[in-house]
């Protein structure tokens, strides 16, 4: 349910990588020299003065913003809003370092992997034979040959 | 259903400030942020900055910093954008927007009618 | 800030046939695998309308008549088969960094 991160962290490290390949690994270009990253929760503000040296790094907005990883962008990531009119609501809130989680909302549920959206669980006419959870509709009991 | 009115016309005199009103019904306000857009006269649309009316938090397009001051009175599900010392190159229909969220791409899904600026002596 | 280049700026296409605008960005509004990408339809007098969110979604109450593809730095709408009701001008918008941007537009005629 919650947001993958792994993803994005090889998107934002293979993106950094394609302007470094003049510093070690671990270093970025900032300028003329090759930098430390900024630490996760910060976004960089100014290049380093000297090669290895540390960036001036200021802190994303929180609850706004978010960084989970070591980097060397200017900006930070906008916090992902549960969108309570595709059926989510927050699981977890976002932090500095860590991007808002959202689940199902109650009575909502979502079987694939990494929902962007949940759909409403399905009400049975002829009785539940299992309930709805986050992950499966309901499982609805078929109407008797008899009672047709 | 969802809706966002705007009042049609503000005429404005250089120099001079307006503030433009966006009053939202069929939702929950606080639940979405709101985004406004200018489009002059004949041309393309232009991202001014957003609103979270759970907080006030704003984001500004760096170009409108110091020209739009974006409010909002949860009370009465309204969002407000004041644009400070016009000139003609203000003169603008203005559009409020309510924003989606997919998968962290905002999108706006629902636009205002528009308020036509006209700044003139 | 991100450009994006509409192409053609304008064009016309008969009833029935497929039009199909581009649009093309500075540089990539992709991230994590996902497409940071919408298009809007605007008439004259009325405010810009969603079509497509995060490139390829179509939304709710718009005819599947109009699909979006693409990633990167390229993507398509295309509009098959076009009707009269058509007729507007087309702007893509990317959300993956502020400041969020559209571009130029494209004008539909029919034919």
């Known amino acids: 349910q919650g947001t993958n991160s792994i993803s994005e962290s090889l998107k934002l490290r293979r993106r950094v990588r394609e302007t470094d390949k003049n510093c070690s690994e671990g270093l970025y270009q900032g300028g003329p020299f090759c930098c430390q990253p900024c630490q996760p929760g910060k976004k960089k503000v100014e290049d380093c003065k000297m090669n290895g040296g540390t960036p001036t790094c200021a802190p994303c907005t929180e609850g706004k913003e978010y960084m989970d990883k070591n980097h060397y962008a200017d900006k930070c990531r906008r916090c992902t809003l549960c969108d309570e009119e595709h059926g989510l609501e927050v699981e977890t809130n976002c932090t500095l370092t860590q991007n808002t989680k959202c689940k199902c909302k109650p009575d909502f549920y979502c079987d694939s992997p990494g929902c962007e959206h949940c759909v409403r669980c399905a009400s049975c006419e002829h009785g539940t034979l299992e309930p709805c959870t986050a992950t499966s509709n309901t499982n609805c009991r078929k109407q008797s040959p008899r009672n047709r | 259903q969802v809706q966002l009115q705007q009042p049609g016309a503000e005429l404005v005199k250089p120099g001079a400030s307006v503030k433009l009103s966006c009053k939202a019904s069929?939702?929950?306000?606080?639940?979405?942020?709101m985004q406004w857009v200018k489009q002059r006269p004949g041309q393309g649309l232009e991202w001014i900055g957003e609103i979270d009316p759970s907080d006030s938090y704003t984001n500004y397009n760096q170009k409108f910093k110091g020209k739009a001051t974006l409010t909002v009175d949860t009370s009465s599900s309204t969002a407000y954008m004041q644009l400070s010392s016009l000139t003609s190159e203000d003169s603008a229909v203005y559009y409020c927007a309510r924003n989606r969220d997919y998968s962290n791409n905002w999108y706006f899904d629902v636009w205002g009618t528009g308020t036509t600026v006209t700044v003139s002596s | 800030d991100i450009v994006l280049t509409q192409s053609p700026a304008s064009l016309a296409v008969s009833l029935g046939q497929r039009a199909t605008i581009s649009c093309k960005a500075s540089q990539s509004v992709d991230y994590d695998g996902d497409s940071y990408m919408n298009w809007y339809q605007q008439k004259p007098g009325q405010p810009p309308k969603l079509l497509i969110y995060?490139?390829?979604n179509l939304e709710s109450g718009i005819p599947a008549r109009f699909s979006g593809s693409g990633s990167g730095t390229d993507f398509t709408l295309n509009i098959h088969p076009v009707e009269e009701e058509d007729a507007a001008t087309y702007y893509c918008?990317?959300?993956?960094?502020?400041?969020?941007?559209f571009g130029g537009g494209t004008k539909l005629e029919i034919k």
């Open positions: 918008q990317q959300s993956n960094e502020d400041p969020r941007t």
């Open positions: 069929g939702y929950t306000f606080t639940s979405y942020w």
């Open positions: 995060a490139a390829s």
